[in-house]
Amino acid sequence: KTLVLGKEGESAELPCESSQKKITVFTWKFSDQRKILGQHGKGVLIRGGSPSQFDRFDSKKGAWEKGSFPLIINKLKMEDSQTYICELENRKEEVELWVFKVTFSPGTSLLQGQSLTLTLDSNSKVSNPLTECKHKKGKVVSGSKVLSMSNLRVQDSDFWNCTVTLDQKKNWFGMTLSVLGFQKASSIVYKKEGEQVEFSFPLAFTVEKLTGSGELWWQAERASSSKSWITFDLKNKEVSVKRVTQDPKLQMGKKLPLHLTLPQALPQYAGSGNLTLALEAKTGKLHQEVNLVVMRATQLQKNLTCEVWGPTSPKLMLSLKLENKEAKVSKREKAVWVLNPEAGMWQCLLSDGDKVKMDSRIQVLSRGVNQT
């Protein structure tokens, strides 16, 4: 028995070949012997029932001369899954058609971090098929009647070529995924005390109409609990602020990409934020983490100090040095100082290896007097 795979809604071609490789009489039947169609010697396709009953069934007349008499079934339905019989040259050939339906749950437009379950349904009790989906960038996911893709990323968007294999027979279908998310999962901003701070939250997709609501929660390093800094609505890609905290007085852009401005970086603002965006008609939320590190260099009496606040990595080095000279002090700590600094332009550096994350300069005029 030959096996043919077909996807619901599409077409399937069931083979039937003559050993003579020439036109001959043939008949296609259901397993209960009802006639579907055939050719009885005059080269004319004869249908077995009313046109409306058999309008989805056809054959390839152009292939008959070569001894090929396929049964074409269009707009496949689940109930087409059965055995079909081709009668020719005093022999019968059985062809098993397995029609499957593909469902995507929760759908093919998802939020970053969500999971997709692809299910093959069929009303014929076949053994487990192999389902394999390959992204154009090379990523491969496989399963059987159920295929799962978890923790989806923006880069998983686009076309996937999927293959269903059963008894060495293959059928392919495509799916286009749209994974909505921010371009970056997290970002870090380094600022000197008093500088203006800009936070940007670019989305990694473009949609004509984008509607939802969002909020930025902030956990300051110095605070015991987090605080909602701003809430906003997004309607047709226009951003409107609903509520904003009085301290700090944030400004928010009214257009995408989402953009926030903090008038000045202060030690009490240093910390981590979590921007959440809930999109209309989507379950779940998009998240982007943002971090603020603030640096301050001061001289009080005989002590020159450099401090940083905020989420710094343990491998970051804080240094104090007189310009164009070797570092006087360099530590993997959040504060460094020099007693009785000599006059000149001092630099405080926050660095990761040889990469300077930020620096602040302070002019020491004479021992005990400074100017930033």
């Epitope: 203006q196 800009e198 309607k235 047709n236 226009e238 409107s240 602020v241 400004q251 928010m252 852009g253 009214k254 257009k255 953009h259 401005t261 008038p263």
Partner: antibody, heavy 118, light 107 residues
Framework: EVQLLESGGGLVQPGGSLRLSCAAS????????MSWVRQAPGKGLEWVST????????YYADSVKGRFTISRDNSKNTLYLQMNSLRAEDTAVYYC???????????WGKGTTVTVSS | AIQMTQSPSSLSASVGDRVTITCRAS??????LGWCQQKPGKAPKFLIY???TLQSGVPSRFSGSGYGTDFTLTISSLQPEDFATYYC?????????FGQGTKVEIK
């Protein structure tokens, strides 16, 4: 051709009211944000108010908040500005503007003059 | 509110001159800035949006640049019809604010 035509300006006493209208044509009115901008005699431009597209979010300059109301009738392709408790400093030419897809005021009407004087 | 400061407030130039007008925002506004032109007794005409995108129908001698707080409008070769007052407008958020204007006069 996109056109905006303001009307309703005139002379009014302090404390009085006026309703400005702006008839729009040549574009799908309901899908664009619309604004009012004014210009006092011999002065620069001052944004007054904006109403977003069919959602209807409204925004006002502090100088007119609580006194002016912007509204739109998408079925009539018309933008309105209801001005109450008028003051001498509201004297200006009032321009109706259409926002483009990027929310910039890309088309301006010819303006209607409002004079607040006793 | 975001303040927009335009400079100079006026300038005299001749036909064919290269003219540059600057606009500074009191805080970062990305590239959410537009420029418009107004002739005496006429309604303003929109020239440039998103700091550098030319409105359709605007001659290519007009160009805009800038990001954050500092922006420039340049007229590469001044034409007789360009003598007018030019305004910048921040469109970062509400309230929308204009610069005080730069009057370009004939020398």
């Amino acid at each position: 051709e996109v056109q905006l035509l303001e009307s309703g300006g005139g002379l009014v006493q302090p404390g009085g009211s006026l309703r400005l209208s702006c008839a729009a044509s040549g574009f799908t009115f309901s899908t664009y944000a619309m604004s009012w901008v004014r210009q006092a005699p011999g002065k620069g431009l001052e944004w007054v108010s904006t109403i977003s597209d069919n959602i209807g979010n409204t925004y006002y300059a502090d100088s007119v908040k609580g006194r002016f109301t912007i509204s739109r009738d998408n079925s009539k392709n018309t933008l309105y500005l209801q001005m109450n408790s008028l003051r001498a400093e509201d004297t200006a030419v009032y321009y109706c503007t259409k926002d483009n897809e990027d929310y910039y005021m890309d088309v301006w009407g010819k303006g209607t003059t409002v004079t607040v004087s006793s | 509110a975001i303040q927009m400061t335009q400079s100079p407030s006026s300038l005299s130039a001749s036909v064919g001159d290269r003219v540059t007008i600057t606009c500074r925002a009191s805080q970062g506004i990305r590239n959410d800035l537009g420029w418009c032109q107004q002739k005496p007794g006429k309604a303003p005409k929109f020239l440039i949006y998103a700091a550098s995108t030319l409105q359709s129908g605007v001659p290519s001698r007009f160009s805009g640049s800038g990001y954050g707080t500092d922006f420039t409008l340049t007229i590469s070769s001044l034409q007789p019809e360009d003598f007018a007052t030019y305004y910048c407008l921040q469109d970062y958020n509400y309230p929308r604010t204009f610069g005080q204007g730069t009057k370009v006069e004939i020398k």
